[in-house]
């Protein structure tokens, strides 16, 4: 079953290479188990950046080596991606799956274009 997912069109990463955005899914009821996946689309290639399955009301838990962190409130997931560099600029798509209870619902956002600008190296100081 299809589900509406909203996310901002554009986000600019900060000077430390961190970008945050909200992914909101519109469900007709309250799920108990939700899976959120961030996908990156660049040059028609889609790769998985990170994913987390969480129980409603609990924290999102990404893998220890994940570049993503997140929190949830209701049907809103606040996602943060760290360690980004200019070459990581691209379209980051939020995919939400309601895993339990059945039936299974899935929605994919239109994507958030994240722009990353590498900081200028500091000039040598005498």
């Amino acid at each position: 079953k299809a589900m509406h997912v909203a996310q901002p069109a554009v986000v600019l990463a900060n000077s430390r290479g961190t970008a945050s955005f909200v992914c909101e899914y519109a469900s007709p009821g309250k799920a108990t188990e939700v899976r959120v996946t961030v996908l990156r689309q660049a040059d028609s290639q889609v790769t998985e950046v990170c994913a987390a399955t969480y129980m409603m009301g609990n924290e999102l838990t990404f893998l220890d080596d994940s570049i993503c962190t997140g929190t949830s409130s209701g049907n809103q997931v606040n996602l943060t991606i760290q360690g980004l560099r200019a070459m990581d600029t691209g379209l980051y798509i939020c995919k939400v799956e309601l895993m339990y209870p059945p039936p299974y619902y899935m929605g994919i956002g239109n994507g958030t274009q994240i722009y990353v600008i590498d900081p200028e190296p500091c000039p040598d100081s005498d």
């Epitope: 519109a26 007709p28 009821g29 309250k30 108990t32 409130s73 209701g74 049907n75 209870p101 619902y105």
Partner: antibody, heavy 119, light 106 residues
């Protein structure tokens, strides 16, 4: 398309039990969703009574918890409402409906069955 | 229990006009709000869920908005078949309904 149909006696005597059946077609009640009973009092107020989930678990309105029971017959794809010790205050139109999740919007409803509690 | 205060309880409007119904909740419901249309002899019909999402098959004349404790529902370009009673429902904690708004056409 999913269809729900309520049935049961239109008249119940005070202090007796009210028993209603909801017959579901177009979807198996064990495949998913929660299967609810809602009633509408003569003044138009709607009250959620409780549900039985796809897995057989129940959730009831705390105001009715001591009097209500919702069960099912999976072979007939039906679920049932039993309300004990009825009074004239239980006179209402009773609806069955379906929702997703623990709590949710009801996407399919029956057309309702009117029940009068009177001696 | 979360209490829903729906207003007005009745309203009259002209064909082609616009009406707005509001629903105030006793606590933040995280946008878990649905709206129904109810006609005599039928079960309620789901129009909108999660505050603003139209149920498939529902005309875009119907719309919803809100957050926190304040929600609204509008019908644009009123048509004769819109004569009905409209209900709000929250599904953040239990399922509870507003008192209803009876809509008539002038």
């Amino acid at each position: 398309d999913v269809q729900l149909q309520e049935s049961g006696p239109g008249l119940v005597t005070p202090s007796q039990s009210l028993s209603l059946t909801c017959s579901v077609t177009g979807y198996s009640i064990t495949s998913g969703y929660s299967w609810n009973w809602i009633r509408q009092f003569p003044g138009n107020k709607l009250e959620w009574m409780g549900y039985i989930r796809f897995d057989g678990n129940n959730n009831y309105n705390p105001f009715l918890k001591n009097r209500i029971s919702i069960t099912r017959d999976t072979s007939e794809n039906q679920f049932f409402l039993k309300l004990n010790s009825v009074t004239t205050e239980d006179t209402a139109t009773y609806y069955c409906a379906r929702n997703y999740g623990t709590w949710g919007a009801m996407d399919f409803w029956g057309q309702g069955t009117s029940v009068t509690v009177s001696s | 229990d979360i209490v829903l205060t729906q207003s007005p309880s009745s309203l009259s409007a002209s064909l082609g006009g616009k009406v707005t119904i509001t629903c105030k909740t006793s606590q933040d419901i995280n946008k878990y709000m649905a709206w129904y249309q109810h006609k005599p002899g039928k079960g309620p019909r789901l129009l909108i869920y999660y505050t603003s999402i139209l149920q498939p098959g529902i005309p875009s004349r119907f719309s919803g908005s809100g957050s926190g404790t304040d929600y609204s529902f509008s019908i644009n370009n009123l048509e004769p078949e819109d004569i009905a009673t409209y209900y709000c429902q929250q599904y953040d904690n239990l399922n509870t309904f507003g008192g209803g708004t009876m809509l008539e056409i002038k």
